[in-house]
Amino acid sequence: YDFTNCDFEKIKAAYLSTISKDLITYMSGTKSTEFNNTVSCSNRPHCLTEIQSLTFNPTAGCASLAKEMFAMKTKAALAIWCPGYSETQINATQAMKKARKSKVTTNKCLEQVSQLQGLWRRFNRPLLKQQ
């Protein structure tokens, strides 16, 4: 999916008002220095591509985050503010959601969500030069 035509400011507002809090809740009890940020993004569409991938694509050690509250809210925000997102993306992520039996917070998932927090922070500061 091409995130170029999303309403970035509206997505940012949704992140600041609610998604960020859910990410913090998920990470509660974890030191902010525990994980190094290894995933980066260069602009807002790229950041959303990486956020979409990390949030909804299963990875080794972290089967799926799609049932988490922050993931459901991310999906809702993208559905509302990115034209055509629902039609191209939702069915795939819905299927993943159904395949997941229960929520298990592994260390790998915590690391993945830590990466997500970094990507969202980068998304919110699009004018910063890439380190």
Partner: antibody
Framework: QVQLVQSGAEVKKPGSSVKVSCKAS????????INWVRQAPGQGLEWLGV????????IYAEKFQGRVTITADTSTSTAYMELSSLRSEDTAVYYC?????????????WGQGTLVTVSS | QSALTQPPSASGSPGQSVTISCTGT?????????VSWYQQHPGKAPKLMIY???KRPSGVPDRFSGSKSGNTASLTVSGLQAEDEADYYC???????????FGGGTKLTVL
């Protein structure tokens, strides 16, 4: 039972406000969109706006911007639509309608409607 | 945004097919595959018949079908039955995050 139940009919004076409620049951209220649509006597359907409680997003039709306020109370699974500065042309049946999960623009469940009459 | 354009009336005999058109612009029907159709009987709330241009919710007979070409969407009711007599409204998502841009409605009469 999956349903939307709306508050009763209202008679209002021009210039006043009306607040219509819509109580949801039988589904996860927050995940869906709650849209508001009205129908003047003998006329077609007109969309006023939507709220998606999950992310606290409200979007209003341009025509009603500044005059309509849509809110939701997730603890009671109830959505509200308030329309201010009422005029006779606002006389209509007001419906709440559920927007499908993540496809909030398809209205797959409707309330029974609330008749709002604006008359001096 | 202007309402989508529908013919005010359509009719057909039992068993026949009827097609109702709905014309918009590239900012609504032509720009998104987000067209839906609603059936409304007198004094009742509307009912979703078609969504996503051509998908049918469970419980809606397969006599109802939808399609789209350019800026025009169509609802076809085949094998007309007496209970199909109702008002039909098309709706489309429109640019500017309008979730429900409706047509003026078409009164379908079964002769």
């Amino acid at each position: 039972q999956v349903q939307l139940v709306q508050s009763g009919a209202e008679v209002k004076k021009p210039g006043s406000s009306v607040k219509v409620s819509c109580k949801a049951s039988g589904f996860t209220f927050g995940s869906y969109g709650i849209n508001w649509v009205r129908q003047a006597p003998g006329q077609g359907l007109e969309w006023l706006g939507v709220i998606v409680p999950l992310v606290g997003v409200t979007i209003y039709a341009e025509k009603f911007q500044g005059r309509v306020t849509i809110t939701a109370d997730t603890s009671t699974s109830t959505a509200y639509m308030e329309l201010s500065s009422l005029r006779s042309e606002d006389t209509a049946v007001y419906y709440c309608a559920r927007g499908q999960e993540y496809f909030y623009w398809y209205f797959d469940l409707w309330g029974q409607g609330t008749l709002v009459t604006v008359s001096s | 945004q202007s309402a989508l354009t529908q013919p005010p009336s359509a009719s057909g005999s039992p068993g026949q097919s009827v097609t109702i058109s709905c014309t918009g612009t590239s900012s609504d029907i032509g720009g998104y595959d987000r067209v839906s159709w609603y059936q409304q009987h007198p004094g009742k709330a509307p009912k979703l018949m078609i969504y996503g241009v051509s998908k049918r919710p469970s419980g809606v007979p397969d006599r109802f079908s939808g399609s789209k070409s350019g800026n025009t969407a169509s609802l076809t009711v085949s094998g007309l039955q007496a209970e199909d007599e109702a008002d039909y409204y098309c709706s489309s998502y429109a640019s500017g995050h309008t979730f429900g841009l409706f047509g003026g409605g078409t009164k379908l009469t079964v002769l």
